[in-house]
């Protein structure tokens, strides 16, 4: 037997206790599929989050981060502070990469320079805090 609630489209919800009546989602709530028993409250992008896509009756809002921050986690669940290239974020804030490591992005950690000799190559261009070494032809 088909569930009568399956006739309720996205943007509505269906209450079993009310003979499967479809009701429109109230403002600031949504149902992204048909046959849903409730509408979900729209996500609000506040503080360090900003709205990338407005909520609608059929889809949730999507957030990203204000300038100086970047998204982390599924669906941008967190915003993390940006650092400069050549730095990484620690518990004490942005710190320069240690000698022998680099970071060419505003996020993430400092990574070791490539060891050219492991591939039997020589260093063509020295590494910096912001850039990896460039390996050249074999010595």
């Amino acid at each position: 037997l088909q569930d009568p609630c399956s006739n309720c489209p996205a943007g509505t919800f269906c209450d079993n206790n009310r003979n499967q009546i479809c009701s429109p989602c109230p403002p600031n709530s949504f149902s992204s599929a048909g046959g849903q028993r409730t509408c979900d409250i729209c996500r609000q992008c506040k503080g360090v989050f900003r709205t990338r896509k407005e909520c609608s009756s059929t889809s949730n809002a999507e957030c990203d981060c204000t300038p100086g921050f970047h998204c982390l986690g599924a669906g941008c669940s967190m915003c993390e502070q940006d650092c400069k290239q050549g730095q990484e974020l620690t518990k004490k804030g942005c710190k320069d990469c240690c000698f022998g490591t680099f970071n060419d992005q505003k996020r993430g950690i400092c990574r070791p320079w490539t060891n050219c000799s492991l591939d039997g190559k020589s260093v063509l261009v020295n590494g910096t805090k912001e850039r990896d070494v460039v390996c050249g032809p074999s010595p």
């Epitope: 489209p9 009310r18 479809c22 429109p24 109230p26 403002p27 609608s56 009756s57 059929t58």
Partner: antibody, heavy 114, light 107 residues
């Protein structure tokens, strides 16, 4: 800014037909169900019809069932109300509203009179 | 169909007074009631949804309350710009239905 702009109203003879349009902007039209609501002169608001975001589900008020047809063109961000067999009691200001019923257009006036 | 009955039909108030408008549903509509303000020659504007949630940008002098069948819109200190018709409506089930409205006038 959310905007809904109705058009197509005017004077129609009883038994005649008319098609109203509602042009939407400032929001993702294809993600919202839409309503038509009307208001007779110096009267309250009366819901007319609803269409779901994709157009697959449609509801009508009993007073217009079989005479009015609600439709939408998501590519053109436009809602329609095709009205046939018009009666004097259909005379009203016709508003479109999105399904949260939070934004309404400015309305278009339909007068059915001989 | 669910019938929404508003009272009074009209009321005259002075600026600064507290206003209470009533809306009764013919059957239980949970908290699925909204209040709209409609100024002359204008379209309705949403004030309150879900019986008690103030919509974005609505001044906090407007408060909604109630559930099931009895609902109230209160204006704590009425202002000249609040002169308008006020409609309640239910979205508990189709067909959506509205009250006949209450006209708020200034003394």
């Amino acid at each position: 800014e959310v905007q809904l702009v109705e058009s197509g109203g005017g004077l129609v003879k009883p038994g005649g037909s008319r098609k109203l349009s509602c042009a939407a902007s400032g929001f993702t039209f294809s993600e919202f169900g839409m309503h038509w609501v009307r208001q007779a002169p110096d009267k309250g608001l009366k819901w007319v019809a609803y269409i779901s975001s994709g157009g697959s589900t449609i509801y009508y008020a009993d007073t217009v069932k079989g005479r009015f047809t609600i439709s939408r063109d998501n590519a053109k961000n436009t809602l329609f109300l095709q009205m046939t067999s018009l009666r004097s009691e259909d005379t009203a200001m016709y508003y479109c509203a999105r399904d949260w019923v939070d934004y309404w257009g400015q309305g278009t006036t339909l007068t059915v009179s001989s | 169909n669910i019938v929404m009955t508003q009272s009074p039909k009209s009321m005259s108030m002075s600026v600064g007074e507290r206003v209470t408008l009533s809306c009764k549903a013919s059957e239980n509509v949970g908290s699925y009631v909204s209040w709209y303000q409609q100024k002359p020659e204008k379209s309705p504007k949403l004030l309150i949804y879900g019986a008690s949630n103030r919509y974005t940008g609505v001044p906090d002098r407007f408060t909604g309350s109630g559930s099931a069948t009895d609902f109230t819109l209160t204006i704590s200190s009425v202002q000249a710009e609040d002169l308008a018709d006020y409609h309640c409506g239910q979205s508990y089930s189709y067909p959506l239905t509205f009250g006949a409205g209450t006209k708020l006038e200034l003394k």
